[in-house]
């Protein structure tokens, strides 16, 4: 079947990094500079992505694969394939329409991105606050009086923070 298909369509023999050149009797021509084809049998090569401005090149374009970008220091990637760059804030802040703003009392952010999240409510688990929260750190929950029996664990760390969604304000 492959043999039959290649007789019918000579382009199917063109490997990645080349294209089937209709102007030259459908022979396989190498992709021109700044272009690539990642699969065989292509009739055109795709233009390489250029990492300009706030984007910087993480991986150069080759004849068989597109360039990959990341963001300049002080920014982080968003979207599939780092389609956007978003500015970082400091820990203890979140990014809003008005720029980087400190977390409100009772919330924290231990990352340079994402939103401020409420401190863990220790009392919901019958615990007490062992270490107070800050803008940058969650509270640490300690034992309730009933837990202070011999052999009981004295500190319950808060649940690991998940990657937050992003809230504009």
């Amino acid at each position: 079947f492959e043999r039959t298909r290649s007789l019918q369509d000579p382009c199917s023999n063109c490997p990645a990094g080349t294209f089937c050149d209709n102007n030259r009797n459908q022979i396989c021509s190498p992709c021109p500079p700044n272009s690539f084809s990642s699969a065989g049998g292509q009739r055109t090569c795709d233009i390489c992505r250029q990492c300009k401005g706030v984007f910087r090149t993480r991986k150069e374009c080759s004849s068989t694969s597109n360039a990959e970008c990341d963001c300049t220091p002080g920014f982080h990637c968003l979207g599939a394939g780092c389609s956007m760059c978003e500015q970082d804030c400091k820990q203890g802040q979140e990014l809003t329409k008005k720029g980087c703003k400190d977390c409100c009392f009772g919330t924290f952010n231990d990352q340079k991105r994402g939103i401020c999240r409420p401190w863990t409510n220790c009392s919901l688990d019958g615990k007490s606050v062992l270490v107070n929260g800050t803008k940058e750190r969650d509270v640490v929950c300690g034992p309730s009086p009933a837990d202070l029996s011999p052999g009981a664990s004295s500190v319950t760390p808060p649940a690991p923070a998940r990657e937050p969604g992003h809230s504009p304000q």
Partner: nanobody, 123 residues
Framework: EVQLVESGGGLVQPGGSLRLSCAAS????????MTWFRQAPGKGLEWVAH????????YYEDSVKGRFTVSRDNAKNSVYLQMNSLRAEDTAVYYC????????????????WGQGTTVTVSS
Amino acid sequence: EVQLVESGGGLVQPGGSLRLSCAASGFTFSSHWMTWFRQAPGKGLEWVAHIKEDGSEKYYEDSVKGRFTVSRDNAKNSVYLQMNSLRAEDTAVYYCARGGDGYSDSHFGVDVWGQGTTVTVSS
């Protein structure tokens, strides 16, 4: 081709004014927030201001509030930064950038960047 081209930079004395322009092409300008950033010599990029698609919302970095005004003309596919009462610390390369789809609703990411225009404030 999607493109942003800044102009209007130059040398100005402290207390002076400049108006920067950013001409957009290759995309539907009126569908995007537009943002100004700047980079002072030896420093990182700093957000300056941004403006909503229809110009109805504008926000500024604290140090430029009351001195800088961002505006846009969707008929001319352009965004502007009027800079008054300029100070030495405003010396920087100024860039305009396009807010990506969903900007301000779910993120503040930019996806297209101009080449920059240099503003020097010096006596």
